[in-house]
């Protein structure tokens, strides 16, 4: 499943954040004209992934891949041949299930976020990791940081690169 | 995507190997009448996953899941709704792309194997992990071990459990 077919710039940013790759994150954020406060907010999220080590990146990448390739994201877009299969439930827009997950990651409670992840990947190690990341983000980010992250996400979702 | 619908015994063996579960591996190998040398060969592969820890299992599971749910594997079997999606490109036979990946894992060079994985999952962390596993298998397994692993795979592919 080619996630990049839905909203490539979103996945660029996600994997740059999750892989702790500052260079790739800067490159991706420049493409969507991120402000300094928006960059700062994303780097706080990135710090959580880096602090939690490689396993964190992989497990959360696994969650993202799983949600993105789930029935909820593949929606009505299945053609009669796999050749034409696309994830674009809404043109090239990001899948609503992914959007919901990201929103809960920023604005929901740890329980709400972990429950949403559990719908897609219920391995205990995955859920523990999701909670650790969520708690880290809640501890590191101010309300203002979260608002900046949400405004950046809006830029991403409405970007021509999405 | 239900991989088990294509060749359940193959995925039983793969996940037993990748998860370092000796008991499950023994059970699965008994079902296909594996010889002692064939068991030894599979256990050497399993050792590589165990030595490389949880991260290795998760990442390689991600690769296998991705290849198994790729366009190359979904073949002509797509229905009009995702609900009915099946992988059975050739009845219940294993997908050729999965077969090719496993063959390269055993008989190809590290470059050849990683390049094939890269067609499905181009994250650096996934590809580095694939190379580490491949290097380990090349170091641990003799030519005879590899021949035994290939003969076991033939038994799996032609088994009524596939």
């Amino acid at each position: 499943v080619k996630m990049a077919e839905t909203c490539p710039i979103f996945y660029d940013v996600f994997f740059a954040v999750a892989n702790g790759n500052e260079l790739l994150l800067d490159l991706s954020l420049t493409k969507v004209n991120a402000t300094e406060p928006e960059r700062t907010a994303m780097k706080k999220i990135q710090d959580c992934y880096v602090e939690n080590g490689l396993i964190s990146r992989v497990l959360d990448g696994l969650v993202m891949t799983t949600i993105s390739s789930s029935k909820d994201c593949m929606g009505e877009a299945v053609q009669n041949t796999v050749e034409d299969l696309k994830l674009n439930t809404l043109g090239r827009e990001i899948c609503p299930a992914v959007k919901r997950g990201v929103d809960l990651f920023l604005t929901g409670t740890p329980d709400e976020y972990v429950e949403q992840v559990a719908q897609y990947k219920a391995l205990p190690v995955v859920l523990e990791n999701a909670r650790i990341l969520k708690n880290c983000v809640d501890a590191k980010m101010t309300e203002e940081d979260k608002e900046n992250a949400l405004s950046l996400l809006d830029k991403i979702y409405t970007s021509p690169l999405c | 995507v239900k991989m088990a619908e294509t060749c359940p015994i193959f995925y039983d063996v793969f996940f037993a190997v990748a998860n370092g579960n000796e008991l499950l591996l023994d059970l699965s190998l008994t079902k296909v009448n594996a010889t002692e040398p064939e068991r030894t060969a599979m256990k050497k592969i399993q050792d590589c996953y165990v030595e490389n820890g949880l991260i290795s299992r998760v990442l390689d599971g991600l690769v296998m899941t991705t290849i198994s749910s790729s366009k190359d594997c979904m073949g002509e079997a797509v229905q009009n709704t995702v609900e009915d999606l099946k992988l059975n490109t050739l009845g219940r036979e294993i997908c050729p792309a999965v077969k090719r990946g496993v063959d390269l894992f055993l008989t190809g060079t590290p470059d050849e194997y990683v390049e094939q994985v890269a067609q499905y999952k181009a994250l650096p962390v996934v590809l580095e992990n694939a190379r580490i596993l491949k290097n380990c298998v090349d170091a641990k397994m003799t030519e005879e071990d590899k021949e035994n692993a290939l003969s076991l795979l033939d038994k799996i592919y032609t088994s009524p459990l596939c």
Partner: antibody, heavy 123, light 107 residues
């Protein structure tokens, strides 16, 4: 097997230019990021530049930015390093190296190296 | 740039010895670390990547460990072919940076 052969080194005066080439064989050239790494006489290794597998991104160490340009020709399996405004401190053996991992190319792990070509900047 | 510091700079050892080289990063590089071996007049050779992953064809006596800022390269039983200079290199960022090298010489 993977073979990388550098050429174009030599003695050059400060302020002048030189172009290094690296011919690659034995692998799918267009799938890999390629790098230049240098080593001053008796010193350690210093990464100089990278070009991604498709030429879409190029990065340089700060000390050569604006003076050196990396490029590639995927049809001829060759990468180049155009070195302008050379300085004495650019004196080094220049190695061409291939990224270990294909396509992603973002991780600068140097899996394969050429034998190197010596560049001497001296008046 | 991330600074990589190796210790010791020179190490005298005998065949059969267990040898350990340390590499410290000025900030966390997670597991994105490689080790290289270089012999005089030759190009470096990749030994280990992702902190502990052995490259193809490298003997099992070489092993790597560590994450974050502290890493080690261990040679379990030094062989005559192992006398060389060893470099660590982080690849968490561009620019990738190398340690200054550790020369392993015959005691």
């Amino acid at each position: 097997q993977v073979v990388l052969v550098e050429s174009g080194g030599g003695v050059v005066q400060p302020g002048r230019s030189l172009r290094l080439s690296c011919a690659a064989s034995g692998f799918t050239f267009s799938s890999y990021g390629m790098h230049w790494v240098r080593q001053a006489p008796g010193k350690g290794l210093e990464w100089v530049a990278v070009i991604w597998y498709d030429g879409s991104n190029k990065y340089y160490v700060d000390s050569v930015k604006g003076r050196f340009t990396i490029s590639r020709d995927n049809s001829n399996n060759t990468i180049y390093l155009q070195m302008n405004s050379l300085r004495a401190e650019d004196t080094a053996v220049y190695y061409c190296a291939r990224s270990l991992i294909p396509v992603a190319g973002t991780d600068p792990i140097f899996g394969y190296w050429g034998q190197g070509t010596l560049v001497t900047v001296s008046s | 740039d991330i600074q990589m510091t190796q210790s010791p700079s020179t190490l005298s050892a005998s065949v059969g010895d267990r040898v350990t080289i340390t590499c410290r990063a000025s900030q966390s590089v997670s597991s994105w670390l490689a080790w290289y071996q270089q012999k005089p007049g030759k190009a470096p050779k990749l030994l280990i990547f992702k902190a502990s992953g052995l490259e193809s064809g490298v003997p099992f006596r070489f092993s790597g460990s560590g994450s974050g800022t502290e890493f080690t390269l261990t040679i379990s039983s030094l062989q005559p072919d192992d006398f060389a200079t060893y470099y660590c290199q982080q690849y968490n960022t561009y620019s990738p940076t190398f340690g200054q090298g550790t020369k392993v010489e015959i005691k």
